[in-house]
């Protein structure tokens, strides 16, 4: 039951996270004009990954897309790429995780297949979340650098009669949405990976205890498992259940080479 809950919660958290990453990517307020001493402004500028906007105090808002590709800063292109990669990985992860959900039955899908799919989607969510966090952080760093550069410019070269009002930009709402969404996707991915451990079938090689009976050696497996000669070499990839009534969730598993596809 706990594994199902962990998997379900991981899916929901990742879903919210990816929705947030998509929202952040589409938002126009990645950077907003710094109002410093003046909370009321006649002209308010803000910028997104795809367009820049101006809102006048009259209420009129005008947005212009960045119609050039080569003329854009490399950092902006990098942030765009990171966010898109995050969305694509997240979307694929969501698709995979839907089929991996324990509550959804698809034909006669093996538990091991569901475990592998859960792990795959979990890793995808983790990478997706990291991409979003990286993208937002790169943009934030770019803003901080530009902010202090423009601040320096504001206080230099003012010897002349004419002053130029330097527009400084600070963190926009999209950055916070992106950070939170990336974090949620990351958490969801970790939860999926944890759930995967509980989903995978029993594959542990149990150490056999030898009892020397008269005449020939027989190795007995503890806990009601079948006895076999040797030390479990033929039990690899076989489900050997004891008579106890155990739910699938309670069957503890450990990662094997087959879990990482």
């Amino acid at each position: 039951m706990a594994v199902t809950a962990c998997q379900g919660l991981g899916f929901v958290v990742s879903l919210i996270g990816i929705a947030g990453i998509i929202a952040a990517t589409c938002m126009d307020q990645w950077s907003t004009q710094d109002l410093y001493n003046n909370p009321v402004t006649a002209v308010f500028n803000y910028q997104g990954l795809w367009r820049s906007c101006v809102r006048e105090s009259s209420g009129f808002t005008e947005c212009r897309g960045y119609f050039t590709l080569l003329g854009l800063p490399a950092m902006l292109q990098a942030v765009r790429a990171l966010m898109i990669v995050g969305i694509v990985l997240g979307a694929i992860g969501l698709l995979v995780s839907i089929f991996a959900l324990k509550c959804i039955r698809i034909g006669s899908m093996e538990d091991s297949a569901k475990a592998n799919m859960t792990l795959t989607s979990g890793i995808m969510f983790i990478v997706s979340g990291l991409c979003a966090i990286a993208g937002v952080s790169v943009f934030a760093n770019m803003l901080v650098t530009n902010f202090w550069m423009s601040t320096a410019n504001m206080y230099t070269g003012m010897g002349g009669m004419v002053q130029t009002v330097q527009t400084r930009y600070t963190f926009g709402a999209a950055l916070f949405v992106g950070w939170v969404a990336g974090g949620l996707t990351l958490i969801g991915g970790v939860m999926m990976c944890i759930a995967c451990r509980g989903l995978a079938p029993e594959e542990t090689n149990y150490k056999a205890v030898s009892y020397h009976a008269s005449g020939h050696s027989v190795a007995y497996k503890p806990g009601g498992f079948k006895a076999s000669t040797g030390f479990g070499s033929n039990t690899k990839n076989k489900k050997i259940y004891d008579g106890g009534a155990r739910t699938e969730d309670e069957v503890q598993s450990y990662p094997s080479k087959h879990d990482y596809v």
């Epitope: 006649a42 009259s58 009129f60 005008e62 009002v165």
Partner: antibody, heavy 118, light 113 residues
Framework: EVQLVQSGAEVKKPGASVKVSCKAS????????MHWVRQAPGQRLEWMGM????????NYNEKFKGRVTITRDTSASTAYMELSSLRSEDTAVYYC???????????WGQGTTVTVSS | DIVLTQSPDSLAVSLGERATISCKSS????????????LTWYQQKPGQPPKLLIY???TRESGVPDRFSGSGSGTDFTLTISSLQAEDVAVYYC?????????FGQGTKLEIK
């Protein structure tokens, strides 16, 4: 047709207060910022402050802060400008004006003459 | 506050001639976000409130005759009346629409020569 109709001329003594009204019609009153601008004889136009009729949020020129209060009555589609502690230099024509695209004033009231004299 | 200085203070032009009024700003009125200049021109006739002519430095308000045109960028702006008509006799003001408090030029009185 958009119209801004202001209250009549006022004569006040120094230290007194004056409240000028501006009734809007022909448009959605709550959708546009209403500004107040004054013009003293032979002087340039001087921006005093503004109010958003929908939210009631205001912004004033520092020069008039503490002396000017802009309010509105949405049910009557009317904006008000009250100037206190009147001085002789406050003698001017007071205008209300609607803000439009480009942060420009497209419609103005006819003006209210306020005379401050002892 | 932004200071706007108009020149000349008064101007006399013959009917049908070109009239040019200048407006200089103490700060740039160009907004980098949309590359628009936040300068507005008004016409005021005696006993009347100002009338909007030009906004964004060069965009003519609807209903304004096309003989009125605005130009300039940054700190230097010009209002041009290509062919002066008798009804154009008035005082013309420029306005900073970029930052609060909004400020106005001292005005240019246009007369017929």
């Amino acid at each position: 047709e958009v119209q801004l109709v202001q209250s009549g001329a006022e004569v006040k003594k120094p230290g007194a207060s004056v409240k000028v009204s501006c009734k809007a019609s022909g448009y959605t009153f709550t959708s546009y910022w209403m500004h107040w601008v004054r013009q003293a004889p032979g002087q340039r136009l001087e921006w005093m402050g503004m109010i958003h009729p929908n939210s009631g949020s205001t912004n004033y020129n520092e020069k008039f802060k503490g002396r000017v209060t802009i309010t509105r009555d949405t049910s009557a589609s009317t904006a008000y400008m009250e100037l206190s502690s009147l001085r002789s230099e406050d003698t001017a024509v007071y205008y209300c004006a609607r803000l439009k695209t480009g942060n420009s004033f497209d419609y103005w009231g006819q003006g209210t003459t306020v005379t401050v004299s002892s | 506050d932004i200071v706007l200085t108009q020149s000349p203070d008064s101007l006399a032009v013959s009917l049908g001639e070109r009239a040019t009024i200048s407006c200089k700003s103490s700060q740039s009125l160009l907004n980098s976000g949309n590359q628009k200049n936040y300068l507005t021109w008004y016409q005021q006739k005696p006993g009347q409130p100002p009338k909007l002519l030009i906004y964004w430095a060069s965009t003519r308000e609807s209903g304004v005759p096309d003989r009125f045109s605005g130009s300039g960028s940054g700190t230097d702006f010009t209002l041009t009346i290509s062919s002066l008509q008798a009804e154009d006799v008035a005082v013309y003001y420029c306005q900073n629409a970029y930052t609060y408090p909004f400020t106005f030029g001292q005005g240019t009185k246009l007369e017929i020569k």
